[in-house]
């Protein structure tokens, strides 16, 4: 059997740290057997069998020029093996962050805090943190640890499915390379890391006959579980084309009527979502959708829910009193209560 312990990594490769003494081990001999060492491709002897170092080659203060392949051979010239030296650094604690797009699952991602230059893998696990009685020192088996299954294809991510929203979890991400291992522990609660995906299916439509209105509608993100006890609230932003500032509203449902749009101009609209009890943070913004308020008069047909106006909207006199708002019981969200007077913008 080989006197060389096989470090994790490809076979035939041994590892060391720059600036440190490195010992290479001849794999095909018995421990202590005297061997000769050569640099592959160079005929001069590096270390002879009379060195007193047996089957090992010692490189003092290794540097990048020492990286490469070495040949060791026995006293009678038989090949003892070839060894490739790769230099790098032991692992440092990885940087870990976790996020949840819904209240049942969360994922953690990691990256090295220092580049080791060596083959590296990550061990990922988690356990549920529980507050045990003072007399109990044992960890309940129901608390783990369990593996956190990693994404295939080497993506630096693992996913915990079926998490409990009100529980705390301890994530363990251990960076392993041939020179050692280093662990980062991260305590997470679903409540604090919850960040929904942005709402989907955002549509912006004009409201016929209302040159200052736009109706926006959207749906829950597909990743949000369809259960009634965890709702989302929304934030909507809109702005006319080429206007730098966004206006922000917080709709109560899955649609919103904007009543202060600039007539004749296309408007960008985007929405964001958050847990309705303010757990976690707001989602990123949805992709922008665009819409332009309608022009012209209200259609002659009266909608089933009642007649809003019989005349087209005109720009009121500045000093005229605001007309009363129509009563809209069947569709309370169709019109908005923020502006008492709709104004048609006159563009210079």
């Amino acid at each position: 059997s080989s006197p060389c312990p096989q470090a994790w990594g490809p076979p035939g490769v041994q590892y060391g740290q720059p600036g440190r003494s490195v010992k290479l081990c001849c794999p095909g001999v018995t421990a202590g057997d005297p061997v000769s060492w050569f640099r592959d491709g160079e005929p001069k002897l590096l270390q002879g069998p009379d060195s007193g170092l047996g089957h090992e080659l010692v490189l003092a203060q290794a540097d990048s020029t020492d990286e490469g392949t070495y040949i060791c051979q026995t006293l009678d010239g038989a090949l003892g093996g070839t060894v490739t030296l790769q230099l790098g650094y032991p692992p440092a604690r990885p940087v870990v962050s976790c996020q949840a797009a819904d209240y049942e699952n969360f994922s953690c991602t990691w990256s090295p805090s220092q580049i080791s230059g060596l083959p590296t893998r990550y061990l990922t696990s988690y356990r549920k943190k529980t507050v045990l009685g003072a007399d109990s020192q044992r960890r309940s088996p129901s608390t783990g640890p369990w593996p956190c299954p990693q994404d295939p294809l080497g993506a630096a991510r693992c996913v915990v499915h079926g998490a409990e929203f009100w529980s705390q979890y301890r994530i363990n991400v251990t960076e392993v390379n041939p020179l050692g291992a280093s662990t980062r522990l991260l305590d997470v609660s679903l409540q604090s890391i919850l960040r929904p995906d942005p709402p989907q299916g955002l549509r912006v439509e004009s409201v016929p006959g209302y040159p200052r209105r736009l109706r926006a509608s959207w749906t829950y993100p597909a990743s949000w579980p369809c259960q009634p006890h965890f709702l989302l609230k929304f934030r909507l932003q809109y702005r006319p084309a080429q206007h730098p500032a966004w206006s922000t509203v917080e709709p109560a449902g899955l649609e919103e009527v904007i009543t202060d749009a600039v007539a004749g101009l296309p408007h960008a609209v985007r929405v964001s979502a958050r847990d309705f009890l303010d757990a976690g943070t707001w989602s990123t913004w949805s992709p922008e959708a665009w819409g332009t308020p309608s022009t012209g008069t209200i259609p002659k047909e009266i909608p089933a829910w009642g007649q809003l106006h019989t005349q087209p909207e005109v720009e009121p006199q500045v000093d005229s009193p605001a007309p009363p708002r129509p009563s809209l019981q069947p569709h309370p969200r169709l019109l908005d209560h923020r502006d008492s007077v709709e104004q048609v913008a006159v563009l210079a």
Epitope: P43, K44, G48, A78, L79
Partner: antibody, heavy 117, light 107 residues
Framework: QVQLVQSGAEVKKPGASVKVSCKAS????????MHWLRQRPGQGLEWIGN????????HYNQKFKDRATLTVDKSTSTAYMELSSLRSEDTAVYYC??????????WGQGTLVTVSS | DIVLTQSPATLSLSPGERATLSCRAS??????LHWYQQKPGQAPRLLIK???QSISGIPARFSGSGSGTDFTLTISSLEPEDFAVYYC?????????FGQGTKLEIK
Amino acid sequence: QVQLVQSGAEVKKPGASVKVSCKASGYTFTNYWMHWLRQRPGQGLEWIGNIGPSDSKTHYNQKFKDRATLTVDKSTSTAYMELSSLRSEDTAVYYCARGDYVLFTYWGQGTLVTVSS
Amino acid sequence: DIVLTQSPATLSLSPGERATLSCRASQSISNNLHWYQQKPGQAPRLLIKYASQSISGIPARFSGSGSGTDFTLTISSLEPEDFAVYYCQQSYSWPLTFGQGTKLEIK
């Protein structure tokens, strides 16, 4: 005991090629390097190249790089040296030698290659 | 290529005498120098490796010394079978090269 038995003498015309064989016995063939050397009549020794024991990796003397090809057949524990584009100055005794990476510890009996028109 | 120069080209001595053969390298080669003996009609035989390391089966009267560029093969007391051609070989860099040989003949 270690034995290296080379193929018999050859007479070749200029421009031709010659392939000399060296059958090894008495040791594990894939554990040792095989070197090829030559000695012109009344002259010293010239190293042609060597071939690795397990991976067939070669090192050549640049002087022979374009004309010499070293190969092995592990199944028969036989090493080969082919020399192409022969000229009269290639007339020599060609040796295979088992060794370590850079030394020659056991030698074949030699193969005389005569290049003559 | 590293050039090895052997001297003398021919050395005439009698059995029982001490023989000193020299090999000089065109550049420093540390101790990467080896000695071979070749008798007429035979293949060479390794005598000394790495300047001074003895080889199993080689009589103790053969010894080597030197480092850098200057090397010596010494035969402490010549036996009749020692009369042959001696070659030095370097293994410091490719290609491996030999000296032109020293012929040790009976006086």
